[in-house]
């Protein structure tokens, strides 16, 4: 039994890191393998993650971690019984994939303005709480070409757009994702999408 693709890990910079790897053949990850991990820190202890299958030869492990700080470094040991298959390390702050924003809501009761709000996925004491920026994706269910991205570079988790920038009388969907420039993170997954019917009063045209 050998590791074909070494484990790569990403952290949500809060409490979970996800590691994925591939073996050289079909493997029952949960019964044959264990991933041991430990924070390099005087008051830490070793933990064991039981991996799950991720395709025939693929394995994935969800590591429960202490609240992350930038200096953290974890040792990783992949075992098959008594055999050490791979040894490595992982700095969560260098491989961050933020959590997805939640509670995306479209408020249509403001006159001819759409207000989109969502929740920051981090608690206020987390470093990323004040460092997330967002991308909002809005698209028409009727017209695949009507697809747009709004970059929200301020901290407030909201976006205002004129209803008239979208077509009237049709349904739209929106979703939002996050990233943090300070740690050069990847983008989060998209939030669940929300749907609304766009309608607004057409301005009276004078001839």
């Amino acid at each position: 039994m050998k590791v074909l693709q070494e484990p790569t890990c990403v952290s949500d910079y809060m409490s979970i890191s996800t590691c994925e790897w591939k073996m050289n053949g079909p493997t029952n990850c949960s019964t044959e393998l264990r991933l041991l991990y430990q924070l390099v820190f005087l008051l830490s202890e070793a933990h064991t993650c039981i991996p799950e299958n991720n395709g025939g030869a693929g394995c994935v492990c969800h590591l429960l971690m202490d609240d992350v700080v930038s200096a953290d470094n974890y040792t990783l040991d992949l075992w098959a019984g008594q055999q050490l298959l791979w040894k490595g390390s992982f700095k969560p702050s260098e491989h961050v994939k933020p959590r997805a924003p939640g509670n995306l809501t479209v408020h249509t009761n403001v006159s001819d303005t759409l207000l989109l709000t969502w929740s920051n996925p981090y608690p206020p004491d987390n470093y990323l709480y004040n460092h997330l920026t967002y991308a909002v994706n809005i698209w028409s269910e009727n017209d695949p070409a009507d697809f747009r991205i709004y970059n929200v570079t301020y901290l407030e988790p909201s976006l205002r757009i004129a209803a008239s920038t979208l077509k009237s009388g049709i349904s739209y969907r929106a979703r939002v994702r996050a990233w943090a420039q300070c740690y050069n993170t990847t983008w989060s997954e998209w939030s669940p999408s929300t749907k609304w019917h766009n309608s607004y009063r057409e301005p009276f045209e004078q001839h």
Partner: antibody
Framework: EVQLVQSGGGLVHPGGSLRLSCAGS????????MFWVRQAPGKGLEWVSG???????NYADSVKGRFTISRDNAKNSLYLQMNSLRAEDMAVYYC?????????WGQGTLVTVSS | EIVLTQSPGTLSLSPGERATLSCRAS???????LAWYQQKPGQAPRLLIF???SRATGIPDRFSGSGSGTDFTLTISRLEPEDFAVYYC??????????FGQGTKVEIK
């Protein structure tokens, strides 16, 4: 808002015992290492003890064998049991959250050791 | 055990002036594990700088940290009245634990 609220200080005779408490709120207590740091009157800061999320502990040489740090994650609380107290243990004791450094501190509680 | 020595013991300056505080370690310290705190009379210490140069949440940008190895510096670019206090450096060592410098008092001249 992260808060650490301390209780349990007071006057004790040399050789006596005292238990300090620290209640945390506004953060996930169970995922953070916790510490005690003290400051003798007119002196600097001295790290006393720390406890990891899994219960691993460490102590300064000056208190080893006399002080015991513990935590109750269900109550979001940190404790310091101080036995065989000496005059040199007299100080303001702070609880703190942190790891390699201490990012949030309690308000401090005064422990007076005097006959 | 790593010993941190801060200098000067006392710094007498006027508001608006620049303050430069030094922290010297008896052996090399990882920059990741070096922090600075501010303490005012009757108050708990407050984290200013971690990782030698990163400002903690809510700390004004007039505070900056620098250095590596055995020599570290805290700089306050323009002293405000509320900056007069005692400042401590602190390091974490994987064997000896956490140690503080003896402190530098910044007082009004």
């Amino acid at each position: 808002e992260v808060q650490l609220v301390q209780s349990g200080g007071g006057l004790v005779h040399p050789g006596g015992s005292l238990r300090l408490s620290c209640a945390g709120s506004g953060f996930t207590f169970s995922r953070n290492a916790m510490f005690w740091v003290r400051q003798a009157p007119g002196k600097g800061l001295e790290w006393v003890s720390g406890i990891g999320t899994g219960g691993a502990t460490n102590y300064a040489d000056s208190v080893k064998g006399r002080f015991t740090i513990s935590r109750d994650n269900a109550k979001n609380s940190l404790y310091l049991q101080m036995n065989s107290l000496r005059a040199e243990d007299m100080a303001v004791y702070y609880c703190a959250r942190g790891r390699y450094y201490f990012d949030y501190w309690g308000q401090g509680t005064l422990v007076t050791v005097s006959s | 055990e790593i010993v941190l020595t801060q200098s000067p013991g006392t710094l007498s300056l006027s508001p608006g002036e620049r303050a430069t505080l030094s922290c010297r370690a008896s052996q090399s310290v990882s920059s990741s594990y070096l922090a600075w705190y501010q303490q005012k009379p009757g108050q708990a210490p407050r984290l200013l700088i971690f990782g030698a140069s990163s400002r903690a949440t809510g700390i004004p940008d007039r505070f900056s940290g620098s250095g590596s190895g055995t020599d570290f510096t805290l700089t306050i670019s323009r002293l405000e009245p509320e900056d007069f206090a005692v400042y401590y450096c602190q390091q974490y060592g994987s064997s000896a634990g956490w140690t503080f410098g003896q402190g530098t008092k910044v007082e009004i001249k």
